[in-house]
Protein backbone atom coordinates (compact mmCIF):
# COMPACT_ATOMS: atom_id res chain seq x y z
CA UNK A 1 0.00 0.00 0.00
CA UNK A 2 1.02 4.01 -0.75
CA UNK A 3 -0.11 6.89 1.15
CA UNK A 4 -0.81 9.84 -1.16
CA UNK A 5 -1.29 13.31 0.09
CA UNK A 6 -3.96 15.37 -1.47
CA UNK A 7 -2.56 18.95 -0.50
CA UNK A 8 1.24 19.77 0.35
CA UNK A 9 0.17 23.22 1.66
CA UNK A 10 -2.35 24.78 3.01
CA UNK A 11 -2.65 28.12 4.15
CA UNK A 12 -5.41 29.26 6.97
CA UNK A 13 -6.25 32.53 8.86
CA UNK A 14 -6.42 32.25 12.83
CA UNK A 15 -9.49 31.04 14.00
CA UNK A 16 -10.23 29.34 11.37
CA UNK A 17 -10.40 25.58 10.88
CA UNK A 18 -8.52 22.94 9.01
CA UNK A 19 -8.81 19.44 7.81
CA UNK A 20 -5.81 18.05 6.58
CA UNK A 21 -6.71 14.63 4.45
CA UNK A 22 -4.67 11.66 3.11
CA UNK A 23 -5.26 8.65 1.50
CA UNK A 24 -4.29 5.22 1.35
CA UNK A 25 -4.16 3.00 -2.02
CA UNK A 26 -3.49 0.22 -3.43
CA UNK A 27 -3.07 -3.39 -1.80
CA UNK A 28 -4.37 -3.67 1.86
CA UNK A 29 -3.80 -7.05 3.77
CA UNK A 30 -7.27 -7.49 5.02
CA UNK A 31 -6.51 -10.90 6.92
CA UNK A 32 -7.23 -11.38 10.52
CA UNK A 33 -3.67 -10.97 11.80
CA UNK A 34 -2.89 -7.60 10.42
CA UNK A 35 -3.92 -4.81 12.30
CA UNK A 36 -3.57 -0.98 10.94
CA UNK A 37 -2.98 2.41 12.55
CA UNK A 38 -3.51 5.32 11.05
CA UNK A 39 -2.12 8.65 12.81
CA UNK A 40 -0.67 12.08 12.22
CA UNK A 41 2.16 13.94 14.19
CA UNK A 42 4.19 16.56 13.26
CA UNK A 43 8.02 16.92 11.98
CA UNK A 44 10.58 19.03 10.96
CA UNK A 45 11.06 21.51 7.41
CA UNK A 46 14.59 20.40 6.28
CA UNK A 47 15.50 16.89 7.29
CA UNK A 48 17.21 14.19 4.99
CA UNK A 49 13.96 12.24 5.61
CA UNK A 50 10.66 14.00 5.56
CA UNK A 51 9.04 12.66 8.50
CA UNK A 52 11.77 10.92 9.99
CA UNK A 53 11.21 13.00 13.43
CA UNK A 54 7.76 13.19 15.42
CA UNK A 55 6.96 15.96 17.80
CA UNK A 56 3.45 15.90 19.16
CA UNK A 57 0.33 17.57 18.13
CA UNK A 58 -0.98 20.31 20.41
CA UNK A 59 0.25 17.79 23.03
CA UNK A 60 -1.44 14.72 21.48
CA UNK A 61 1.33 12.18 20.95
CA UNK A 62 1.09 10.26 17.78
CA UNK A 63 -0.88 7.66 20.30
CA UNK A 64 -3.24 9.76 21.13
CA UNK A 65 -4.26 10.56 17.49
CA UNK A 66 -4.61 6.98 15.94
CA UNK A 67 -6.91 5.37 14.50
CA UNK A 68 -6.67 1.47 14.85
CA UNK A 69 -8.48 -0.89 12.64
CA UNK A 70 -7.70 -4.72 13.99
CA UNK A 71 -9.02 -7.15 11.09
CA UNK A 72 -12.27 -5.49 9.52
CA UNK A 73 -12.90 -3.59 12.81
CA UNK A 74 -14.08 0.53 12.24
CA UNK A 75 -11.54 2.87 13.13
CA UNK A 76 -11.00 4.22 16.46
CA UNK A 77 -9.73 6.46 18.60
CA UNK A 78 -9.13 8.57 21.64
CA UNK A 79 -12.09 10.98 20.98
CA UNK A 80 -12.43 12.88 23.72
CA UNK A 81 -8.73 13.57 24.73
CA UNK A 82 -8.33 15.03 21.04
CA UNK A 83 -11.30 16.76 21.06
CA UNK A 84 -10.16 18.61 24.13
CA UNK A 85 -7.10 19.69 22.42
CA UNK A 86 -9.22 21.04 19.38
CA UNK A 87 -8.89 17.80 17.28
CA UNK A 88 -10.37 15.37 15.91
CA UNK A 89 -8.96 12.17 13.57
CA UNK A 90 -11.52 10.53 11.56
CA UNK A 91 -11.13 7.73 8.45
CA UNK A 92 -13.49 6.30 6.20
CA UNK A 93 -13.92 3.02 3.84
CA UNK A 94 -12.49 4.26 0.92
CA UNK A 95 -9.21 5.02 2.45
CA UNK A 96 -9.36 8.51 3.51
CA UNK A 97 -8.08 9.84 7.07
CA UNK A 98 -7.86 13.22 8.15
CA UNK A 99 -7.35 15.31 11.28
CA UNK A 100 -9.26 18.15 12.00
CA UNK A 101 -7.93 21.01 13.67
CA UNK A 102 -10.29 24.18 15.42
CA UNK A 103 -9.66 27.02 16.21
CA UNK A 104 -5.98 27.44 14.56
CA UNK A 105 -3.59 29.24 15.93
CA UNK A 106 -0.24 30.72 14.38
CA UNK A 107 1.68 28.14 16.78
CA UNK A 108 -0.22 25.07 15.10
CA UNK A 109 1.98 26.09 11.79
CA UNK A 110 5.08 23.65 10.65
CA UNK A 111 5.21 20.13 9.05
CA UNK A 112 2.42 17.54 9.55
CA UNK A 113 3.08 14.23 8.64
CA UNK A 114 0.17 11.08 8.35
CA UNK A 115 0.95 7.66 9.07
CA UNK A 116 -0.35 4.19 7.94
CA UNK A 117 1.39 1.10 9.58
CA UNK A 118 0.59 -2.17 9.12
CA UNK A 119 1.39 -4.68 11.91
CA UNK A 120 1.28 -8.42 11.79
CA UNK A 121 0.63 -10.74 14.35
CA UNK A 122 3.72 -10.83 16.88
CA UNK A 123 5.80 -8.72 13.92
CA UNK A 124 6.75 -5.13 13.81
CA UNK A 125 6.03 -2.42 11.48
CA UNK A 126 5.82 -1.76 7.89
CA UNK A 127 5.02 1.69 7.37
CA UNK A 128 4.32 4.34 4.95
CA UNK A 129 3.83 8.23 5.64
CA UNK A 130 2.98 11.41 3.99
CA UNK A 131 3.87 15.10 4.13
CA UNK A 132 2.05 18.07 4.39
CA UNK A 133 2.68 22.11 5.38
CA UNK A 134 0.30 23.89 7.14
CA UNK A 135 0.87 28.26 7.21
CA UNK A 136 -1.24 30.03 9.88
CA UNK A 137 -1.79 33.67 8.79
CA UNK A 138 -2.53 36.87 10.63
CA UNK A 139 -3.05 40.01 9.65
CA UNK A 140 -4.07 41.70 6.35
CA UNK A 141 -1.99 39.52 4.45
CA UNK A 142 -4.53 36.15 5.78
CA UNK A 143 -6.61 34.73 3.16
CA UNK A 144 -10.38 34.94 4.36
CA UNK A 145 -10.82 31.15 4.51
CA UNK A 146 -8.38 27.72 3.79
CA UNK A 147 -6.76 27.67 0.81
CA UNK A 148 -4.95 24.32 -0.39
CA UNK A 149 -2.67 24.01 -2.98
CA UNK A 150 -2.43 20.75 -4.70
CA UNK A 151 0.86 18.15 -4.00
CA UNK A 152 2.85 18.98 -7.42
CA UNK A 153 6.55 17.92 -6.63
CA UNK A 154 7.45 18.57 -10.30
CA UNK A 155 4.64 21.04 -11.84
CA UNK A 156 7.41 22.71 -13.98
CA UNK A 157 7.87 19.15 -15.96
CA UNK A 158 4.18 17.74 -15.48
CA UNK A 159 3.95 14.67 -17.40
CA UNK A 160 0.09 15.28 -17.56
CA UNK A 161 -2.83 13.31 -16.24
CA UNK A 162 -1.33 10.15 -17.53
CA UNK A 163 0.95 9.46 -14.65
CA UNK A 164 -1.14 9.20 -12.16
CA UNK A 165 -2.71 5.10 -12.17
CA UNK A 166 -6.07 5.47 -13.43
CA UNK A 167 -7.84 3.63 -10.59
CA UNK A 168 -6.67 6.08 -8.11
CA UNK A 169 -8.20 8.72 -10.86
CA UNK A 170 -11.35 6.97 -10.20
CA UNK A 171 -11.27 6.36 -6.49
CA UNK A 172 -10.88 9.91 -6.41
CA UNK A 173 -13.18 10.69 -9.02
CA UNK A 174 -15.96 8.31 -7.30
CA UNK A 175 -16.09 9.52 -3.62
CA UNK A 176 -16.04 12.63 -5.13
CA UNK A 177 -19.27 12.17 -6.85
CA UNK A 178 -20.87 10.39 -4.01
CA UNK A 179 -20.23 13.10 -1.91
CA UNK A 180 -21.45 15.93 -4.35
CA UNK A 181 -24.44 13.49 -5.62
CA UNK A 182 -25.50 13.32 -2.37
CA UNK A 183 -24.84 16.06 -0.94
CA UNK A 184 -26.96 18.41 -3.19
CA UNK A 185 -29.35 15.88 -3.29
CA UNK A 186 -29.80 16.54 0.38
CA UNK A 187 -30.05 20.06 0.66
CA UNK A 188 -32.45 21.10 2.81
CA UNK A 189 -35.77 22.84 1.33
CA UNK A 190 -34.80 26.61 2.71
CA UNK A 191 -31.59 25.96 0.29
CA UNK A 192 -33.77 25.75 -2.71
CA UNK A 193 -35.50 29.27 -1.63
CA UNK A 194 -32.73 30.79 -1.78
CA UNK A 195 -33.01 33.83 -4.36
CA UNK A 196 -29.61 34.34 -5.12
CA UNK A 197 -27.96 33.18 -8.04
CA UNK A 198 -26.87 29.88 -7.33
CA UNK A 199 -23.20 29.10 -7.55
CA UNK A 200 -21.15 26.24 -9.86
CA UNK A 201 -21.90 22.76 -7.89
CA UNK A 202 -18.22 21.80 -6.94
CA UNK A 203 -16.72 18.59 -8.09
CA UNK A 204 -13.12 17.57 -6.39
CA UNK A 205 -11.54 16.35 -9.38
CA UNK A 206 -7.97 15.67 -9.35
CA UNK A 207 -5.64 18.32 -10.93
CA UNK A 208 -3.22 18.19 -13.86
CA UNK A 209 -0.17 19.51 -12.34
CA UNK A 210 -0.42 17.29 -9.59
CA UNK A 211 -1.31 14.32 -11.64
CA UNK A 212 2.85 13.34 -11.33
CA UNK A 213 4.93 10.67 -10.72
CA UNK A 214 7.08 11.82 -7.37
CA UNK A 215 10.94 11.84 -7.91
CA UNK A 216 11.68 9.18 -5.03
CA UNK A 217 12.04 6.06 -5.86
CA UNK A 218 10.00 4.50 -4.09
CA UNK A 219 7.47 6.86 -2.83
CA UNK A 220 3.87 6.44 -4.65
CA UNK A 221 2.82 8.73 -7.47
CA UNK A 222 0.98 12.02 -5.76
CA UNK A 223 -2.32 11.88 -6.84
CA UNK A 224 -4.32 15.14 -5.47
CA UNK A 225 -7.08 16.92 -6.39
CA UNK A 226 -8.75 20.70 -6.46
CA UNK A 227 -12.46 22.02 -6.24
CA UNK A 228 -13.10 22.62 -9.40
CA UNK A 229 -16.50 23.92 -11.48
CA UNK A 230 -17.25 22.47 -14.74
CA UNK A 231 -19.19 24.20 -17.13
CA UNK A 232 -22.00 23.49 -19.28
CA UNK A 233 -21.81 20.17 -21.01
CA UNK A 234 -18.02 19.51 -20.06
CA UNK A 235 -19.24 17.04 -17.37
CA UNK A 236 -21.29 15.11 -20.29
CA UNK A 237 -17.70 15.51 -22.32
CA UNK A 238 -15.54 14.55 -19.46
CA UNK A 239 -17.95 11.41 -18.60
CA UNK A 240 -18.06 10.33 -22.23
CA UNK A 241 -14.39 10.30 -22.28
CA UNK A 242 -13.86 8.39 -19.22
CA UNK A 243 -16.55 5.93 -20.35
CA UNK A 244 -14.35 5.22 -23.34
CA UNK A 245 -10.90 4.91 -21.30
CA UNK A 246 -9.51 8.15 -22.38
CA UNK A 247 -7.84 10.34 -19.22
CA UNK A 248 -9.03 13.71 -19.63
CA UNK A 249 -7.44 16.29 -21.26
CA UNK A 250 -6.03 19.11 -19.81
CA UNK A 251 -8.71 21.46 -20.33
CA UNK A 252 -10.85 19.39 -18.21
CA UNK A 253 -8.52 20.10 -15.38
CA UNK A 254 -8.23 23.58 -13.24
CA UNK A 255 -5.11 23.48 -11.36
CA UNK A 256 -5.70 26.23 -8.78
CA UNK A 257 -5.20 26.58 -5.82
CA UNK A 258 -8.50 25.36 -3.99
CA UNK A 259 -10.93 27.03 -1.47
CA UNK A 260 -11.23 24.49 1.37
CA UNK A 261 -15.01 23.97 1.49
CA UNK A 262 -16.56 22.77 4.97
CA UNK A 263 -17.31 19.23 4.78
CA UNK A 264 -20.48 18.27 4.80
CA UNK A 265 -21.82 21.54 3.35
CA UNK A 266 -22.35 21.62 -0.41
CA UNK A 267 -22.81 24.40 -2.41
CA UNK A 268 -26.50 25.79 -2.48
CA UNK A 269 -28.43 25.85 -5.59
CA UNK A 270 -31.62 27.53 -6.22
CA UNK A 271 -34.68 26.07 -7.84
CA UNK A 272 -35.27 26.82 -11.57
CA UNK A 273 -33.70 24.80 -14.69
CA UNK A 274 -30.26 25.91 -14.14
CA UNK A 275 -29.31 23.93 -11.10
CA UNK A 276 -31.54 21.13 -12.40
CA UNK A 277 -29.97 20.89 -15.79
CA UNK A 278 -26.78 20.77 -13.85
CA UNK A 279 -27.37 17.92 -11.58
CA UNK A 280 -28.59 16.32 -14.30
CA UNK A 281 -25.31 16.88 -15.92
CA UNK A 282 -23.22 15.91 -12.82
CA UNK A 283 -25.68 12.68 -12.61
CA UNK A 284 -24.97 11.84 -16.48
CA UNK A 285 -20.81 12.25 -15.49
CA UNK A 286 -20.93 10.26 -12.08
CA UNK A 287 -22.92 7.65 -13.65
CA UNK A 288 -20.28 7.32 -16.23
CA UNK A 289 -17.71 7.41 -13.74
CA UNK A 290 -19.18 4.56 -11.40
CA UNK A 291 -19.77 2.43 -14.89
CA UNK A 292 -16.32 2.94 -15.72
CA UNK A 293 -14.69 2.36 -12.82
CA UNK A 294 -16.35 -0.74 -11.69
CA UNK A 295 -14.94 -2.29 -14.76
CA UNK A 296 -11.40 -1.74 -13.78
CA UNK B 1 21.73 16.61 19.92
CA UNK B 2 20.23 13.57 20.83
CA UNK B 3 21.30 12.43 24.18
CA UNK B 4 20.46 9.64 26.90
CA UNK B 5 21.93 10.49 30.30
CA UNK B 6 21.87 7.90 32.93
CA UNK B 7 22.22 7.64 36.95
CA UNK B 8 25.44 6.64 38.75
CA UNK B 9 26.35 3.24 39.90
CA UNK B 10 24.45 1.35 42.43
CA UNK B 11 25.99 -1.33 45.12
CA UNK B 12 22.47 -2.91 46.05
CA UNK B 13 22.37 -6.15 48.83
CA UNK B 14 20.30 -9.38 47.70
CA UNK B 15 16.81 -8.66 48.31
CA UNK B 16 17.06 -5.29 47.99
CA UNK B 17 15.79 -2.95 45.02
CA UNK B 18 17.83 -0.56 42.35
CA UNK B 19 16.21 2.32 41.05
CA UNK B 20 17.98 3.65 37.71
CA UNK B 21 17.27 6.87 36.17
CA UNK B 22 17.73 8.10 32.22
CA UNK B 23 17.30 11.31 31.11
CA UNK B 24 16.19 12.67 27.87
CA UNK B 25 17.22 15.68 25.49
CA UNK B 26 17.34 16.50 22.19
CA UNK B 27 14.48 15.36 21.57
CA UNK B 28 10.59 14.95 21.43
CA UNK B 29 10.46 12.71 24.83
CA UNK B 30 6.69 11.66 24.72
CA UNK B 31 6.91 10.54 21.52
CA UNK B 32 9.75 7.82 21.53
CA UNK B 33 10.12 4.55 22.92
CA UNK B 34 12.60 4.03 26.01
CA UNK B 35 13.97 0.71 26.62
CA UNK B 36 16.05 -1.27 28.72
CA UNK B 37 18.86 -3.67 27.95
CA UNK B 38 21.14 -5.00 30.53
CA UNK B 39 24.37 -6.56 30.24
CA UNK B 40 26.07 -9.17 32.57
CA UNK B 41 29.77 -9.11 33.20
CA UNK B 42 31.21 -11.14 30.51
CA UNK B 43 28.20 -11.49 28.21
CA UNK B 44 26.10 -10.11 25.75
CA UNK B 45 22.60 -7.81 25.71
CA UNK B 46 19.59 -8.84 27.39
CA UNK B 47 16.08 -6.68 26.32
CA UNK B 48 14.26 -5.87 29.66
CA UNK B 49 11.36 -4.01 28.57
CA UNK B 50 10.14 -0.80 27.37
CA UNK B 51 8.13 2.73 27.95
CA UNK B 52 6.51 5.08 25.59
CA UNK B 53 6.84 8.58 27.75
CA UNK B 54 3.74 9.52 26.36
CA UNK B 55 1.49 7.43 27.77
CA UNK B 56 3.18 5.58 30.49
CA UNK B 57 2.08 2.60 29.13
CA UNK B 58 5.36 -0.32 29.61
CA UNK B 59 6.18 -3.69 27.95
CA UNK B 60 8.71 -6.12 29.81
CA UNK B 61 9.67 -9.31 28.55
CA UNK B 62 8.48 -12.05 30.29
CA UNK B 63 11.90 -12.86 32.32
CA UNK B 64 11.39 -9.06 34.18
CA UNK B 65 7.88 -8.56 34.03
CA UNK B 66 7.34 -9.62 37.92
CA UNK B 67 10.22 -7.84 39.49
CA UNK B 68 10.79 -4.69 37.13
CA UNK B 69 8.89 -1.36 36.88
CA UNK B 70 9.16 1.59 34.33
CA UNK B 71 8.02 4.56 35.03
CA UNK B 72 8.33 7.93 33.47
CA UNK B 73 8.57 11.97 34.43
CA UNK B 74 7.67 13.94 31.50
CA UNK B 75 7.82 17.37 33.21
CA UNK B 76 11.99 16.29 33.83
CA UNK B 77 12.13 13.89 30.69
CA UNK B 78 12.84 10.96 32.56
CA UNK B 79 12.31 7.40 32.51
CA UNK B 80 13.13 5.35 35.24
CA UNK B 81 13.84 1.47 35.92
CA UNK B 82 13.13 -0.05 39.06
CA UNK B 83 14.20 -4.18 39.65
CA UNK B 84 13.33 -5.29 42.85
CA UNK B 85 14.25 -8.64 44.80
CA UNK B 86 18.05 -8.20 43.66
CA UNK B 87 20.19 -11.54 43.26
CA UNK B 88 23.95 -11.46 42.16
CA UNK B 89 23.19 -12.51 39.13
CA UNK B 90 21.26 -8.85 38.42
CA UNK B 91 24.97 -7.82 38.71
CA UNK B 92 25.18 -5.69 35.41
CA UNK B 93 25.72 -2.48 33.15
CA UNK B 94 21.98 -1.29 32.53
CA UNK B 95 21.62 0.77 29.60
CA UNK B 96 18.62 2.64 28.55
CA UNK B 97 18.43 2.95 24.64
CA UNK B 98 15.92 4.82 22.30
CA UNK B 99 14.05 3.40 19.59
CA UNK B 100 11.98 4.47 16.80
CA UNK B 101 8.79 2.64 16.44
CA UNK B 102 5.36 3.50 16.25
CA UNK B 103 3.54 0.28 17.14
CA UNK B 104 5.55 -2.54 16.52
CA UNK B 105 9.83 -3.00 16.93
CA UNK B 106 12.69 -1.03 15.72
CA UNK B 107 16.61 -0.56 16.00
CA UNK B 108 18.04 1.46 18.90
CA UNK B 109 19.32 4.29 17.40
CA UNK B 110 20.38 6.78 20.78
CA UNK B 111 21.81 4.88 23.50
CA UNK B 112 22.84 5.60 27.18
CA UNK B 113 26.49 5.62 29.10
CA UNK B 114 25.13 2.58 31.15
CA UNK B 115 24.69 2.24 34.81
CA UNK B 116 26.88 -0.50 36.40
CA UNK B 117 24.50 -1.92 39.55
CA UNK B 118 26.49 -4.39 42.03
CA UNK B 119 24.60 -7.03 44.03
CA UNK B 120 26.60 -8.52 46.79
CA UNK B 121 26.57 -8.80 50.34
CA UNK C 1 11.10 -15.80 20.85
CA UNK C 2 13.63 -15.55 17.34
CA UNK C 3 17.17 -16.79 18.68
CA UNK C 4 20.13 -15.21 17.43
CA UNK C 5 23.35 -16.90 17.00
CA UNK C 6 26.49 -15.55 16.11
CA UNK C 7 29.98 -16.67 14.75
CA UNK C 8 32.84 -16.88 15.44
CA UNK C 9 33.02 -15.97 18.65
CA UNK C 10 36.14 -14.33 18.22
CA UNK C 11 37.83 -13.55 15.35
CA UNK C 12 41.65 -12.38 14.99
CA UNK C 13 42.41 -10.52 11.91
CA UNK C 14 45.96 -7.85 11.33
CA UNK C 15 45.09 -4.35 10.71
CA UNK C 16 44.12 -3.79 6.93
CA UNK C 17 42.68 -6.72 6.44
CA UNK C 18 38.98 -7.90 5.66
CA UNK C 19 36.65 -9.23 8.59
CA UNK C 20 33.55 -11.52 8.04
CA UNK C 21 31.11 -11.72 11.03
CA UNK C 22 28.18 -14.02 10.54
CA UNK C 23 24.67 -13.91 12.28
CA UNK C 24 21.86 -16.11 12.13
CA UNK C 25 18.56 -15.85 13.36
CA UNK C 26 16.31 -19.38 14.30
CA UNK C 27 13.27 -17.94 12.16
CA UNK C 28 13.05 -15.08 8.84
CA UNK C 29 13.74 -11.82 9.74
CA UNK C 30 12.14 -10.44 6.39
CA UNK C 31 8.80 -8.85 6.86
CA UNK C 32 6.72 -10.06 3.72
CA UNK C 33 4.85 -6.48 3.51
CA UNK C 34 7.80 -4.54 2.72
CA UNK C 35 10.65 -7.30 1.67
CA UNK C 36 12.65 -5.72 4.54
CA UNK C 37 15.46 -7.44 6.95
CA UNK C 38 14.50 -6.30 10.74
CA UNK C 39 17.95 -6.49 11.29
CA UNK C 40 20.42 -4.21 13.44
CA UNK C 41 24.30 -4.45 13.80
CA UNK C 42 25.87 -2.66 16.85
CA UNK C 43 29.76 -1.79 18.20
CA UNK C 44 30.70 -1.88 21.39
CA UNK C 45 33.69 -1.28 22.81
CA UNK C 46 34.92 -2.18 26.39
CA UNK C 47 32.93 0.19 28.68
CA UNK C 48 31.29 1.85 26.22
CA UNK C 49 27.44 1.46 25.25
CA UNK C 50 26.66 -0.11 22.16
CA UNK C 51 26.54 2.31 18.73
CA UNK C 52 24.20 1.46 15.63
CA UNK C 53 25.95 0.82 12.80
CA UNK C 54 23.62 -0.91 10.36
CA UNK C 55 19.84 -1.18 10.33
CA UNK C 56 17.14 -3.10 7.65
CA UNK C 57 20.34 -5.82 7.30
CA UNK C 58 22.25 -3.31 4.55
CA UNK C 59 21.79 0.46 5.33
CA UNK C 60 24.54 2.50 7.12
CA UNK C 61 23.84 4.99 9.72
CA UNK C 62 25.11 7.76 9.25
CA UNK C 63 28.38 8.88 9.76
CA UNK C 64 29.35 5.46 10.13
CA UNK C 65 32.41 4.33 7.42
CA UNK C 66 31.40 2.81 4.10
CA UNK C 67 34.14 -0.31 5.05
CA UNK C 68 31.01 -1.54 7.05
CA UNK C 69 29.01 -3.52 5.41
CA UNK C 70 25.55 -5.53 5.69
CA UNK C 71 24.38 -8.32 3.46
CA UNK C 72 22.19 -11.61 4.03
CA UNK C 73 18.59 -12.06 4.15
CA UNK C 74 15.89 -14.45 5.44
CA UNK C 75 18.10 -16.25 8.31
CA UNK C 76 21.75 -15.59 7.34
CA UNK C 77 23.84 -12.23 7.53
CA UNK C 78 26.83 -10.99 7.18
CA UNK C 79 28.48 -7.89 8.38
CA UNK C 80 32.10 -7.27 6.38
CA UNK C 81 34.41 -4.65 7.58
CA UNK C 82 36.72 -4.05 4.28
CA UNK C 83 39.69 -2.76 5.85
CA UNK C 84 40.30 -3.00 9.52
CA UNK C 85 41.22 -0.05 11.17
CA UNK C 86 42.83 0.10 14.81
CA UNK C 87 39.60 1.83 16.32
CA UNK C 88 37.12 -0.96 14.20
CA UNK C 89 38.61 -3.90 17.22
CA UNK C 90 35.71 -4.46 19.31
CA UNK C 91 32.65 -6.61 19.92
CA UNK C 92 30.03 -6.61 17.42
CA UNK C 93 25.99 -7.57 18.17
CA UNK C 94 23.94 -8.63 15.61
CA UNK C 95 19.66 -7.71 16.28
CA UNK C 96 16.88 -8.72 14.98
CA UNK C 97 13.42 -6.40 16.10
CA UNK C 98 10.97 -8.15 14.13
CA UNK C 99 9.54 -10.12 16.52
CA UNK C 100 10.23 -8.37 20.37
CA UNK C 101 13.92 -7.82 20.59
CA UNK C 102 16.49 -10.49 20.69
CA UNK C 103 20.41 -10.09 20.59
CA UNK C 104 22.89 -12.32 19.32
CA UNK C 105 25.70 -13.76 21.52
CA UNK C 106 28.27 -11.40 20.20
CA UNK C 107 31.69 -11.86 18.06
CA UNK C 108 34.98 -9.83 19.21
CA UNK C 109 37.11 -8.90 16.78
CA UNK C 110 40.55 -8.60 18.28
CA UNK C 111 44.47 -7.75 17.08
CA UNK C 112 45.95 -10.90 15.38
Known amino acids: FKVATLYSLYVCPEGQNVTLTCRVFGPVDKGHDVTFYKTWYRSSRGEVQTCSERRPIRNLTFQDLHLHHGGHQAANTSHDLAQRHGLESASDHHGNFSITMRNLTLLDSGLYCCLVVEIRHHHSEHRVHGAMELQVQTGKDAPSSCVAYPSSSQESESKGPSSCPFWVICSLLSSSCTQTLFGTLALSPQAHRNPSPPPPLLLHIPSASSLVQSPEAHSPSICSGVSAPLASLEWLCLGSHLWLGKVPHDRYWVPQAAKCCPSHQPPMTSEGWGSRIQLLQISVFCVSVFLRCSLL | QVQLVQSGAEVKKPGASVKVSCKAS????????INWVRQAPGQGLEWMGR????????YYNEKFKDRVTMTRDTSTSTVYMELSSLRSEDTAVYYC??????????????WGQGTTVTVSS | EIVMTQSPATLSVSPGERATLSCKSSQSVLYSSNQKNYLAWYQQKPGQAPRLLIY???TRESGIPARFSGSGSGTEFTLTISSLQSEDFAVYYC????????FGGGTKVEIK
Open chain 2, 26 to 33: GYSFTDYY
Open chain 2, 97 to 110: ARDDSFYGYWYFDV
Open chain 3, 95 to 102: HQYLSSYT
Open chain 3, 56 to 58: WAS
Open chain 2, 51 to 58: IFPGSGNA
